[in-house]
């Protein structure tokens, strides 16, 4: 597994990065783990990156991910919120120039090298459905979330709001 070498080197000034003219409103460097405390790790294999969900050994370092937060208007005004209907979208980057992408055709989560502006597949709506846990909903496919399947990350369709607390789509962020 690889981590980001040197937080300072990678945590750019907020105004340095822009996506279609929009800068992230904040950024965090955090490790990502499942609801059941398994770590999300990233490994270079055959010149491409693989994503794993695994138990780490006691003193093994957790991989870090840069989460960039963007504001987005809610697509509909049904709520009556008018201009205030904002959502937070995030992009997740475990190493420079690579971002998590939703591959909706394959129902998979992949790491792709790409330049800005990032494609919509790299954006996920942030949900805090549960105390201290977050979920990531595909911008390109509402109702589909990043989840855990067979020790890998996959895209999982959530049919109703009752299922939004399903453990396999809940993740913990830790900045330590």
């Amino acid at each position: 597994a690889f981590g980001i070498s040197g937080v300072q080197k990678y945590t750019r000034a907020l105004h340095d990065s822009s996506i279609t003219g929009i800068s992230p409103i904040t950024e965090y460097l955090a490790s990502l783990s499942t609801y059941n405390d398994q770590s999300i790790t990233f490994a270079l294999e055959d010149e491409s990156y693989e994503i794993y969900v695994e138990d780490l050994k006691k003193d093994e370092k957790k991989d870090k991910v840069l989460l960039s937060y963007y504001e987005s208007q809610h697509p509909s005004n049904e709520s009556g919120d008018g201009v205030d209907g904002k959502m937070l979208m995030v992009t997740l980057s475990p190493t420079k120039d690579f971002w998590l992408h939703a591959n909706n055709k394959e129902h998979s989560v992949e790491l792709h090298k790409c330049e800005k502006p990032l494609p919509d597949q790299a954006f996920f709506v942030l949900h805090n459905m549960h105390s201290n846990c977050v979920s990531f909903e595909c911008k390109t496919d509402p109702g589909v979330f990043i989840g855990v399947k067979d020790n890998h990350l996959a895209l999982i369709k959530v049919d109703s709001s009752e299922n939004l607390c399903t453990e396999n789509i809940l993740f913990k962020l830790s900045e330590t």
Epitope: H74, D81, N128, M129, S161, C165
Partner: antibody
């Protein structure tokens, strides 16, 4: 427009409990976290805790974990806070608040109720 | 718990003045700061979030700045309605904490 309407001022005796309400309107109640904030007379603000109406999930400031209970009634779009074993230290204005974002709590308080004054006195 | 310290505690200014108040965090909080104004007898209102983002409908005379531990709120050309308490707050992480406030009075 977004409105958080809180219940009226209350005088309670030391040792008693009381429950205040916060009726939300003008937005989708279940999609936003609701927080509660305390302001003692002439003092600053203290965050008590938050609840997500959709799931009932909540987070608390440790200082208030044994003092406050947060609940919601989705059918009436109302959030409640019950305070127990009241002492003079609990005399304050209590605000319910809502953040700016659907689905996500960043513990930012974009909308505020008018406040409920609680006076604890025998 | 991260402690937020505001200065000055109070200031007396005239309409049209430019005023800057400070907020210091006891440890690095990135840009996770919000500012609120509380007029006498009213509920607080959100002015700035994530250190420098003006909230919807907030006049552009309000500007937030800073990163890490030191933050400022500047009011360009103070209006009569700006006589109020101003609070900074650490956001994002639980528990969020507020500063003790800066009171802005008009001469």
């Amino acid at each position: 427009q977004v409105n958080l309407l809180q219940s009226g001022a209350t005088l309670v005796k030391p040792g008693a409990s009381m429950k205040m309400s916060c009726k939300a309107s003008g937005y989708s109640f279940t999609d936003y976290w609701v927080s509660w904030v305390k302001q003692s007379h002439g003092k600053s603000l203290e965050w008590i805790g938050e609840i997500y109406p959709n799931s009932g999930a909540n987070n608390f400031n440790k200082e208030f974990k044994d003092k406050a209970t947060l609940t919601v009634d989705k059918s009436t779009s109302t959030a409640y806070m019950e305070l127990t074993r009241l002492t003079s230290e609990d005399s304050a204005v209590y605000y319910c608040t809502r953040g700016p974002y659907y689905y996500s709590s960043q513990i930012i308080f974009a909308y505020w109720g008018q406040g409920t004054l609680v006076t604890v006195s025998s | 718990i991260i402690v937020m310290t505001q200065s000055p505690k109070s200031m007396s200014i005239s309409v049209g003045d430019r005023v800057t108040m400070n907020c210091k965090a006891s440890q690095n909080v990135g840009n996770n700061i919000a500012w609120y104004r509380q007029k006498p007898g009213q509920s607080p209102e959100l002015l700035i979030y994530y250190a420098s983002n003006r909230y919807t409908g907030v006049p552009d005379r309000f500007t937030g700045g800073g990163y890490g531990t030191d933050f400022t709120l500047t009011i360009n050309s103070v209006q009569a309605e700006d006589a109020a308490f101003y609070y900074c707050q650490r956001i994002y992480n639980s528990p969020p904490t507020f500063g003790g406030g800066t009171k802005v009075e008009l001469k």
